[in-house]
């Protein structure tokens, strides 16, 4: 058993039929010694008396908010949550496996630049009685500070018969050095509680590996005289790290016909312009990637050829 926060305790249980469970001793936070009784959740049934209560925790029915009282007055609360371990593996029932980039990916994170700011998100099909608390650091043995806000419900989607909820959180490294080579990874830890079930999820990454630039901005076409060719120009996204001479991007320019089956013409360039042939009903799209490190491409910015 360990303390998650003041008055909230996590009981770690091996989860199998007829498991013995864990013996837990609760102590009433009061100078009082006599006349103390204990109840669980909303029940008025007295579970025991005295300053301490000893319970055998085996299942969710044994978890919950234990309250000690004296003469009708509440003295203190202790909330017991359960963390299940089945066949040596901690349960992951609350969050959905996103399966990308690999199986057992519950947290996904992205950064728009090298400023030390990043966003993580996760999915669940659970709609209420949920708690998410996020902590982060750079490195784990001598951790350096990363500040995370409160998670927010960022999207709701219908997937077949199920509703899926996306939660996200923004974090910022306290003393980020954008140009420095990273030697220690960022660690992100999410404590998740559904009703009385506790689970924790972690992700470890270098900012360089989660970079995904915003799409190029101000995408424009300039027809070239007496030609089917056009000059496509664009700019670095506002959110990208500066100076651009150091934090450079490379770009992919694509000409795509109306039909997905039509051949795509692609040009790669380090410049912020390119000359391409604009076919009727086609569209021109440009995306960006860090020039010197193969992290994710941005989403496409697009304009019609006409």
């Amino acid at each position: 058993i360990w303390e998650l926060k003041k008055d909230v305790y996590v009981v770690e249980l091996d989860w199998y039929p007829d498991a013995p469970g864990e013996m837990v001793v609760l102590t009433c936070d009061t100078p009082e010694e006599d006349g103390i009784t204990w109840t669980l959740d909303q029940s008025s049934e007295v579970l025991g008396s005295g300053k301490t209560l000893t319970i055998q925790v085996k299942e969710f029915g044994d978890a919950g908010q234990y309250t000690c009282h004296k003469g009708g007055e509440v003295l203190s609360h202790s909330l017991l949550l359960l963390h299940k371990k089945e066949d040596g593996i901690w349960s992951t029932d609350i969050l959905k496996d996103q399966k990308e980039p690999k199986n057992k990916t519950f947290l996904r994170c992205e950064a728009k630049n090298y400023s030390g700011r990043f966003t993580c998100w996760w999915l669940t099909t659970i709609s209420t009685d949920l708690t998410f608390s996020v902590k982060s650091s750079r490195g784990s043995s001598d951790p350096q500070g990363v500040t995370c806000g409160a998670a927010t419900l960022s999207a709701e989607r219908v997937r077949g018969d199920n509703k899926e909820y996306e939660y996200s959180v923004e974090c910022q490294e306290d003393s980020a050095c954008p140009a420095a080579e990273e030697s220690l990874p960022i660690e992100v830890m999410v404590d998740a509680v559904h009703k009385l079930k506790y689970e924790n999820y972690t992700s470890s990454f270098f900012i360089r590996d989660i970079i995904k630039p915003d799409p190029p901005k101000n995408l424009q076409l300039k027809p070239l005289k007496n030609s089917r060719q056009v000059e496509v120009s664009w700019e670095y996204p506002d959110t990208w790290s500066t100076p651009h001479s150091y934090f450079s991007l490379t770009f992919c320019v694509q000409v795509q016909g109306k039909s997905k089956r039509e051949k795509k013409d692609r040009v790669f360039t380090d410049k912020t312009s390119a000359t391409v042939i604009c076919r009727k009903n086609a569209s021109i799209s440009v995306r960006a990637q860090d020039r010197y490190y193969s992290s994710s491409w941005s989403e496409w910015a697009s304009v019609p050829c006409s």
Partner: nanobody, 124 residues
């Protein structure tokens, strides 16, 4: 001393409206996600609504959506719950609660601070 003090409860007829307030003292509200949780007579606690630190995101339990509106005034260190189209089943003690993280839990201990509650009775 840290305190959350609810007010604005009372007796109202079905279909009527009430506005609950929750004044915080001893801490600044804008560091916290704020919630309303209620307890009907003889029932367990039920999460009602939550609002993000900056007020930009609001969340409601299904049966409260469209009838209740949560808001906050960080400058006044106060949380509000505007309740309209009230029904007898909305009769409960309404508590406000503060947490530094996202929660829609009904367990008091998961919140950092918790008020004493204000009684709302919907009856003709």
């Amino acid at each position: 001393e840290v305190q959350l003090v609810e007010s604005g409860g009372g007796l109202v007829q079905p279909g009527g409206s009430l506005r609950l307030s929750c004044a915080a003292s001893g801490f600044t509200l804008d560091d916290y996600t704020m919630s309303w949780v209620r307890q009907a007579p003889g029932k367990g606690l039920e999460w009602v609504s939550s609002i993000s630190r900056d007020g930009g995101r609001t969340y409601y339990a299904g049966s409260m959506k469209g009838r209740f509106t949560i808001s906050r005034d960080n400058a006044k260190n106060t949380l509000y719950l505007q309740m309209s189209s009230l029904k007898p089943e909305d009769t409960a003690v309404y508590y406000c609660a503060a947490a530094t993280f996202y929660t829609t839990s009904t367990y008091i201990s998961l919140y950092d601070y918790w008020g004493q509650g204000t009684q709302v009775t919907v009856s003709s």
